[in-house]
């Protein structure tokens, strides 16, 4: 069966939107009005992995781009990157582990934990216009809570 996907945007708990910053980076900033069109639309795919009521394995691709968020070790540190893939082969039910995030729902907020690096989360800074990154702390200065907005296909 083909992998199930939905289109959505994400905003952090401070209402910052995610936009492209160069070809392989996302940044978070406050957008208003027509600028909202700049925000990236994700194709969120529901993939194979350990699942529970509040934890669902997903892959986050950029809609109509052959780019996926992936988590790899760079200089011994878990790092978030945008990785290009062959569009003929993606998305797929069995994604490589670096592409998988555990989507965790807590109090109407979402966290995205790396399946490859437990307790590392997609994060944004308090500051404006900073890169989206993989953070190893929750509940500190950095933001790990998001809301999801559905986008029609």
């Amino acid at each position: 069966a083909p992998v199930r996907s939905l289109n959505c945007t994400l905003r952090d708990s401070q209402q910052k939107s995610l936009v492209m910053s160069g070809p392989y980076e996302l940044k978070a900033l406050h957008l208003q009005g027509q600028d909202m069109e700049q925000q990236v639309v994700f194709s969120m795919s529901f993939v194979q992995g350990e699942e529970s009521n509040d934890k669902i394995p997903v892959a986050l691709g950029l809609k109509e781009k052959n780019l996926y968020l992936s988590c790899v070790l760079k200089d011994d540190k878990p790092t978030l990157q945008l990785e290009s893939v062959d569009p003929k082969n993606y998305p797929k039910k069995k994604m490589e582990k670096r592409f998988v995030f555990n989507k965790i729902e807590i109090n109407n907020k979402l966290e995205f934990e790396s399946a490859q690096f437990p307790n590392w989360y997609i994060s944004t800074s308090q500051a404006e216009n900073m890169p989206v990154f993989l953070g190893g702390t929750k509940g500190g200065q950095d933001i790990t809570d998001f809301t999801m907005q559905f986008v029609s296909s």
């Epitope: 350990e50 990785e83 490589e96 582990k97 399946a115």
Partner: antibody, heavy 120, light 107 residues
Framework: QVTLKESGPGILKPSQTLSLTCSFS??????????VGWIRQPSGKGLEWLAH???????SYNPSLKTQLTISKDTSRNQVFLKITSVDTVDTATYFC????????????WGQGTLVTVSS | DIQMTQTTSSLSASLGDRVTISCRAS??????LSWYQQKPDGTVKLLIY???KLHSGVPSRFSGSGSGTDYSLTISNLEQEDIATYFC?????????FGGGTKLEIK
């Protein structure tokens, strides 16, 4: 010091099930990011990746053999197992287990291999 | 599946030579390439990972380079103990696939 050692039946007949064990020391499969894979090599030929199991139980298989393969682990006993059902003479090979941490994988440590012959 | 091609299946060189072994992927593999040495007794060792990073304990005469679809392993000053077969492995996409190997012999 990391060591891995494969064990198997040596010889078995076509249509039987091949059961392989990888016993390892020097690392734990409960460590985040850790994985163990199986790779085989027919005599005088190249290497073929078969299956991989991660610390969290996540499994990956080579689709060309997926219906025949089952990988599993016993974390407390430091062992990983591979079962291949309905073997044929083409499955005659040396079978290696190897350790890789994180994806993309680099197989950092390898066992010495165990030769399996399928013959009627 | 991603095909990994090592066009040279065997290579003959003299001690002290600089030897280059190449590996080509059927599509871009984002530098997710590692190199392995298999000695005549069957022992396999990791040499290089992530295209160019030298695994700990591997002599510095070994180096790796490449990008996109084309990758290479270089031995700068061939020694007797380097007589072995060398394999590349792509980790970009499941199933992970090896090159066919390049057997290195002494002239």
């Amino acid at each position: 010091q990391v060591t891995l050692k494969e064990s198997g039946p040596g010889i078995l007949k076509p249509s039987q099930t091949l059961s392989l064990t990888c016993s390892f020391s020097g690392f734990s499969l409960s460590t985040s990011g850790m994985g163990v894979g199986w790779i085989r090599q027919p005599s005088g030929k190249g290497l073929e990746w078969l299956a991989h199991i991660w610390w969290d139980g996540d499994e990956s298989y080579n689709p060309s053999l997926k219906t025949q393969l089952t990988i599993s682990k016993d974390t407390s006993r430091n062992q990983v197992f591979l079962k291949i059902t309905s073997v044929d003479t083409v499955d005659t090979a040396t079978y290696f287990c190897a350790r890789a941490r994180y994806d993309p994988p680099w197989f950092v440590d390898w066992g010495q291999g165990t030769l399996v012959t399928v013959s009627s | 599946d991603i095909q990994m091609t090592q066009t040279t299946s065997s290579l003959s060189a003299s001690l002290g030579d600089r030897v280059t072994i190449s590996c080509r992927a059927s599509q871009d593999i984002s530098n997710y390439l590692s190199w392995y040495q298999q000695k005549p007794d069957g022992t396999v060792k990791l040499l290089i990972y992530y295209t160019s990073k030298l695994h700990s304990g591997v002599p510095s005469r070994f180096s790796g380079s490449g990008s996109g679809t084309d990758y290479s392993l270089t031995i700068s000053n061939l020694e007797q103990e380097d007589i072995a077969t060398y394999f590349c492995l792509q980790g970009k996409m499941l199933p992970w696939t090896f090159g066919g190997g390049t057997k290195l012999e002494i002239k």
